[in-house]
Each structure stands twice: as C-alpha cells, then as structure tokens.
C-alpha cells in the first residue's frame, strides 16, 4: 500500500498529551525507531511518568483515506478478551505548512490526533519544494512552534553589515519566489531557504534538511546546507551552510529581525530573538484572555463579545463580514454554522460562508503583536478551511465605548485579515518571566 502522505514520510513526528505526561512518536509511512515499542510500531507512546513504552499503532495494520489514517494493533484494550483493539486515529486537514500532529484525546481503545498540513490539501498551492518539521518539544514537554514564522512567499532579510550582499532566509522551508517575485528574490535558485544576493546574482547557500532542534530550553536551532556538490567560487572551497538560532527573550519585548552574528567561508550564523522561540503556552490561549504568571501579561478581549444577536460588520467590497468574537453567540446570517466570522456575498446574500468558528479560537501575543485567530471554517476549493486573522492595536480613544470596530484588510488563499483598534488590546505587562 502506497504511503498516503509522502511529504510527511521522511520524519518521525511528535505529539504530546500534556495532561497525562505522555509523548507520542509517530511515523506514518514506516515504523518509529524505538526498540521498546517493537519493530513495526507506527505510533509509540512514551509514558514519562512510568518510563514505559507502548505501541498504540502498528505500521503493518494501517488503513487510510484522503483525510484519515488509522493504525490498529493486536492489543486488546479492555482486558476482557473481546475484539476491541488499541488503535490510533489521525484526522488530516488541509493546512498551509507541513504543520504538526496534535494530540486530541484518548479513550480506552483509541488515541486521536489531528493534523493540519499541506499534505492533506486537494491542490498543491501550499506545497513547498522542501520543508522540514518546524516545532520541537523541550525536556518539560512544552511545545515550541515556529510554524507561524514560515513565509509562504517572500523571505526575511537578515541584518548584516556588509553593503555588497543581502542574505534572505525563510524558516523551515524554501523561499517561494514565484508567488511573490520581489526584484531581489527573483534570481534565487529553487529550493533555497537561504539566498545570498550579490548585485544581480543570487546564490543558494542553504536548503532545509533536518527539522528544528532544541539546544536549551530557550534556544532552538535550524540548519541549512547546500545539497549540490558544486562549490561557489567565493567560498574558498567550503560548502555553504546556515545556522539559525532562535532565542526566546528573557522578558516580553517587541520583535526583532534576524541578525548575522558570524560569517566565515560561506558559513553563516544567524541569531533571531523572537518570542516564537518560547513555549507555546507563553504565547497562546484558547480563550479570549492571556494572563497569569506564565504569560507575563494581562490581556482580556472578552468585553468585545456582542450579545443579543448583534454583530460587528466589516465591509469587504464584494462581501460583508459579520464578526462576533469571544463568545458563542450565533451570527444570525450564518445559518447555525457556529461561526465567529461570517462572510456574506453582497450580490447574493444566500451565499454565506463561515470564515472561522468560535470553538476554533486562538489568541496569540508574540513579539508585540496581539492576534485573534478563528479557523476551521467552510472549505475552499483547495480543501483549506477558511480562517480569519484579526490583528489588534491598542487605542485608548477608540469609539464604540472603547470597543472600536474591525476593519477588513484583505484575503490571501482563504485567510481573511482584519485590523481592530480597541482599548481592550492595550496590554499590561508583568516583569518576571
């Protein structure tokens, strides 16, 4: 049986059940290389409390559809000798990066995971030439996830004192110059994740090979190497390589750009101080507030919730967007879709799409930006579920009793962007990270 998602095959992936202190290792095409789980385990559960291993999915007993992968075992799950067997179930949804498998829950018999990934899309529009896993768990099983830094088009310019060259990088994947052919990037070779531009020429100085690594709790490392044997004439016979170290700052701060810290014989060392290198619980909440010692800030957007069936309305030229954030109030136009953001076509108001659902909510505060994300909306033709990204700005004199109002700023590949000036986005900092 052919591998259903070949681009995910090269790696053993990890997911964590934080509640029960369990680390899962997942290899969807072969077997994980863990002796204690046996030679054919595709999903190996490492119980850190008891320091034991259990195979909860066998690579030989795999069944697959386009959106679901199941691994059965021969292990009885209720100890009563019935036909129920322990199994793992991975539901795949279209995403814009390779993404990460997320542990959802586990019953007595089934371990459930969900994975939003380019590999599950109906079209190849989000697929990279080369992409590697962009997250890691530290020794405390806390997740550090750089997926939000991945650029689907364009690149980051590295801060470098050399006036004759410009070094551009992407995070965990190659630079897509076709979708955003900026004048400097246009000459970058396909597959490069680190592109050195000198005058009108561009050189591949590194491609992603291995996934993100954790070197210390607050330092993550990504390494790029040039795959082809052909040496560049300005590298003194050395093969180019790029090492990017992502550093979680010791306290809350604005974002910085990546800085070149060392350069020798086409070996480039970059340091990037960014809160995305911190563990995810420091940055994100599933509710509309971020507070407590863990986050070093106090943010509460719950006063923006609308009651009594009213919604915020944002004009998007062809469409009207109805928003009801931080609550579970149905938007009247949206036909019981559980939408937090509802898109209605002006010329045909029967065309209604959920652009993100209220139970699929993430509030993120990172590098000085406060963002509320609603995902899991109605599918687009690519298979990607519509989502909305609301970027908040602090405005202590906002109208509407300080609440302000969302403004639609554009759409890219079924992701809808809004800005929202409100006094409730004014962040209070505590200083003891």
């Amino acid at each position: 049986q052919a591998a259903p998602f070949p681009e995910l095959c090269s790696y053993t992936w990890e997911a964590v059940d934080t509640k029960n202190n369990v680390l899962y290792k997942i290899n969807i095409c072969g077997s994980v290389d863990i002796v204690q789980c046996g030679p054919s385990s595709a999903v190996c559960m490492h119980d850190l409390k008891t320091r034991t291993y259990h195979s909860v999915g066998d690579s030989v007993l795999r069944s697959a559809t386009r959106s679901l992968l199941e691994f059965n075992t021969t292990v009885s799950c209720d100890q009563q000798g019935t036909n129920h067997r322990v199994q793992s179930s991975i539901a795949f949804l279209c995403g814009k990066t390779l993404g990460t498998p997320e542990f959802v829950t586990a019953t007595e018999c089934v371990h459930y995971f969900e994975w939003r990934t380019t590999a599950a899309c109906k079209k190849d529009i989000f697929k990279a030439n080369k992409e590697v896993p962009c997250y890691v768990f530290d020794e405390e099983l806390r997740k550090h996830d750089l997926n939000p830094l991945i650029k689907l088009s364009g690149a980051y310019l590295v801060d470098d004192s050399d006036p004759d060259t410009s070094l551009f990088i992407n995070v965990c994947r190659d630079i897509d110059t076709l979708r955003d052919p900026g004048s400097q990037l246009r000459a970058c070779p396909p597959g490069t994740a680190a592109c050195l531009v000198r005058g009108h020429q561009a050189f591949d100085v590194g491609q992603p090979r291995d996934g993100l690594k954790v070197v210390r709790k607050d330092r993550l490392v990504l390494s790029y190497v040039r795959e082809e044997a052909g040496k560049l004439d300005f590298c003194d016979g050395h093969s180019p390589a790029v090492t990017i170290t992502f550093v979680c700052p010791s306290e809350r701060r604005e974002g910085t750009i990546p800085k070149l810290t060392a350069k020798s014989n086409c070996r480039y060392e970059i340091e990037w101080i960014t809160e995305y290198a911190c563990h995810r619980d420091y940055l994100e909440s599933k509710t509309c507030s971020l507070s407590g010692e863990q986050q070093d800030v106090s943010i509460d957007l719950t006063p923006l919730a609308q009651s009594g069936g009213s919604s915020y309305i944002s004009d998007g030229k062809e469409y009207l967007f109805y928003l009801n954030v931080c609550g579970e109030t149905e938007i009247q136009f949206c036909n019981k879709k559980q939408a937090a953001v509802c898109q209605v076509k002006k010329s045909d108001t029967s065309q209604v799409k959920a652009a993100g659902r209220y139970h699929n909510q993430t509030l993120r505060y990172s590098d000085g930006f406060l963002t509320l994300i609603y995902f899991g909306g109605d599918e687009c033709s690519s298979g990607f579920q519509r989502m909305s990204v609301i970027n908040f700005e602090c405005n202590k004199t906002a109208g509407n009793d300080g609440k302000g109002t969302p403004v639609f700023t554009g759409e890219v590949d079924c992701t809808y962007f809004f800005t929202w000036d409100t006094e409730y986005a004014c962040v209070h900092h505590h200083h003891h990270h």
Partner: nanobody, 116 residues
C-alpha cells in the same frame, strides 16, 4: 487537604482474586491520571497499571490480562481488580494521582499477600 487512601488488601490463595480501592479527596478526581504501583519486600517500587484522565489504560507486562484498572468519578475512587493472583504479586500496593497542576500524590499503601 489532598489525600489518597487505599483499601482492599489482605491474604489470598494463589489463583484467587482481590479488588483494591483508592479513594481520593481534595482533588478534581476526573482531571487526574491515576497509577497503581507495588513494592515487594526488599525490592524497588514498580509500576503496575495506569488509568489516564481521558480513559486510556496501560498495564505492566507482568500483570497484563490478569489485572484491570477502573474508576468511578462519582465516588472519587480508582480500583485495581486482581485475578489469577500469584505468590510473586505479594507486595504493598500504592496508588498515585498526578496532574499538570499538582505534584504527584501517593497513598499510604495496602498489603497484598498471596500464599497458600
């Protein structure tokens, strides 16, 4: 006050059965993962079985097919049903509760002796 109290231990013949109970107080029981351990005389404490907060169960190879872990959230109690007992199952049995927000909590133990 957070505590776990085990009961149900005793003397049983080889091949016999016992049901151990572990009653929890002072914690949100359903949020906690529950484990049974045992310690035989002169030996290190060893893990026996786990019942995670979501409901999945795992067992040490030495007890698989003979022991069953279960819980009653209404009674804040976790059970260990032990069948086909063997002399090598003789030990003090401890239950443990753990969650991300609490340190591990141990009970005081209950003695199981398997002997003819």
């Amino acid at each position: 006050d957070v505590q776990l109290v085990e009961s149900g231990g005793g003397l049983v013949q080889p091949g016999g059965s016992l049901r151990l109970s572990c009653a929890a107080s002072g914690i949100i029981f359903s949020d906690n993962r529950m484990d049974w351990y045992r310690q035989a005389p002169g030996k290190q404490r060893e893990w026996v079985a786990t019942l995670a907060s979501y409901g999945w169960k795992t067992y040490a190879d030495s007890v698989k097919g003979r022991f069953t872990i279960s819980r009653d959230n209404a009674k804040n109690t976790v059970y260990l049903q032990m069948n086909s007992l063997r002399p090598e199952d003789t030990a003090v049995y401890y239950c443990k509760a753990s969650s991300p927000v609490l340190n591990d909590i141990w009970g005081q133990g209950t003695l199981v002796t398997v002997s003819s």
